[in-house]
């Protein structure tokens, strides 16, 4: 899977979209999870309604919401009041029983609010020298990773 980068401004909302084949994933609930480390598990953040036909209803977990257009085949995740700690690698998933298929890998980048003059030193997003594999850019603001870019900040 390519990784798609979505950029949002700190303090604002970011909307992430994950398109999928609505017939292939018919009847399946969806989920949004956060990747814990490059090889680690993907920790569930929020999932769509337990009743598939009600997947269009927005479900929240904290500041993260999920809604699914099951006919059009678009899963939408909203990250409200984006914070620096929200930056990182996520996945949109299609659930089949206790298993999950990855619909899209997403890198969330948090940009400093240009109107906020506080120290932005704790904001992280990959610099030009850091790189990722299989990149592809979409703007919402979003983009795909450039070849060789890495989705995680270097650890000290």
């Amino acid at each position: 899977h390519n990784t798609t980068v979505f950029q949002g401004v700190a303090g604002q909302s970011l909307q992430v979209s994950c398109p999928y084949d609505s017939m292939k994933h018919w009847g399946r609930r969806k989920a949004w999870c956060r990747q814990l480390g490059e090889k680690g598990p993907c920790q569930r953040v929020v999932s769509t309604h337990n009743l598939w036909l009600l997947s269009f209803l927005r479900r929240w977990n904290g500041s993260t919401a999920i809604t699914d257009d099951t006919l059009g085949g678009t899963l939408t995740i909203t990250l409200r009041n984006l914070q620096p700690h929200d930056a990182g690698l996520y996945q949109c998933q299609s659930l089949h029983g206790s298993e999950a298929d990855t619909l899209r890998k997403v890198l969330v980048e948090v940009l400093a609010d240009p109107l906020d003059h506080r120290d932005a030193g704790d904001l992280w997003f990959p610099g030009e020298s850091e790189s990722f594999e299989d990149a592809h850019v979409e703007h919402s603001i979003s983009r795909s990773l450039l070849e060789g870019e890495i989705p995680f900040p270097p650890t000290s």
């Epitope: 292939k24 009847g27 598939w52 036909l53 009600l54 029983g97 298993e99």
Partner: antibody, heavy 125, light 107 residues
Framework: EVQLVQSGAEVKKPGESLKISCKGS????????IGWVRQMPGKGLEWMGI????????RYSPSFQGQVTISADKSISTAYLQWSSLKASDTAMYYC??????????????????WGQGTTVTVSS | DIQMTQSPSSLSASVGDRVTITCRAS??????LGWYQQKPGKAPKLLIY???SLQSGVPSRFSGSGSGTDFTLTISSLQPEDFATYYC?????????FGQGTKLEIK
């Protein structure tokens, strides 16, 4: 009419290769999961695997992984099951089936609602 | 893999009898279960999907119930054409798995 038509009976020798087919008509073949099921003589049904012709996504039962290859040609609405080296124990009836889509309550479900007539494969020296 | 255990493996009954076949999953499968009927020399036929919903065209004497791990197929009044082998199939997780079958014979 919605149907799946399978290729005819096959008689093969051990070690030979084989590819059997399952052609769909009367429905949008590329938007349905297609499954393969084995039934050995006098025995029950065994789920082999499934393919989504739209993007060639395949899931195998661990019992059949590496033993058979499932594929599809969406341009001709046909799914395939193949062996590179047959064994006598592959002697069986093989069925393909469509996973139909159903709504029940507020849930979405699948059921193998349309079946091929079956292909008999006999492997004997 | 999820194991599906069907019981009984065979059953003798008479026309007009009420018959119950059970299927137990080795782990909870919600209601992602179907029941299939197979007659000798024929392909299987879907009777029940989603554990309890009757497939179009299937006589109402067939019914299904259950959720989680325990499921039942009931034929309220056996007809001559019902003597066949019945299978459950879970499609909750890959690989999907069949029960071993219940052969329903004429007493």
């Amino acid at each position: 009419e919605v149907q799946l038509v399978q290729s005819g009976a096959e008689v093969k020798k051990p070690g030979e290769s084989l590819k059997i087919s399952c052609k769909g008509s009367g429905f949008s073949f590329n938007t349905y999961w297609i499954g393969w099921v084995r039934q050995m003589p006098g025995k029950g049904l065994e789920w082999m695997g499934i393919i989504y012709p739209g993007d060639q996504d395949i899931r195998y039962s661990p019992s059949f992984q590496g033993q058979v290859t499932i594929s599809a040609d969406k341009s001709i609405s046909t799914a395939y099951l193949q062996w590179s080296s047959l064994k006598a124990s592959d002697t069986a009836m093989y069925y393909c089936a469509r996973y139909g889509r159903y709504i029940y309550g507020y849930g979405g479900y699948h059921g193998m609602d349309v079946w091929g007539q079956g292909t008999t494969v006999t492997v004997s020296s | 893999d999820i194991q599906m255990t069907q019981s009984p493996s065979s059953l003798s009954a008479s026309v007009g009898d009420r018959v119950t076949i059970t299927c137990r999953a080795s782990q909870a499968i919600r209601d992602d279960l179907g029941w299939y009927q197979q007659k000798p020399g024929k392909a299987p036929k879907l009777l029940i999907y989603a554990a309890s919903s009757l497939q179009s065209g299937v006589p109402s004497r067939f019914s299904g119930s259950g959720s989680g791990t325990d499921f039942t197929l009931t034929i309220s009044s056996l007809q001559p054409e019902d003597f066949a082998t019945y299978y459950c199939l879970q499609n909750y997780n890959y690989p999907h798995t069949f029960g071993q079958g219940t052969k329903l014979e004429i007493k």
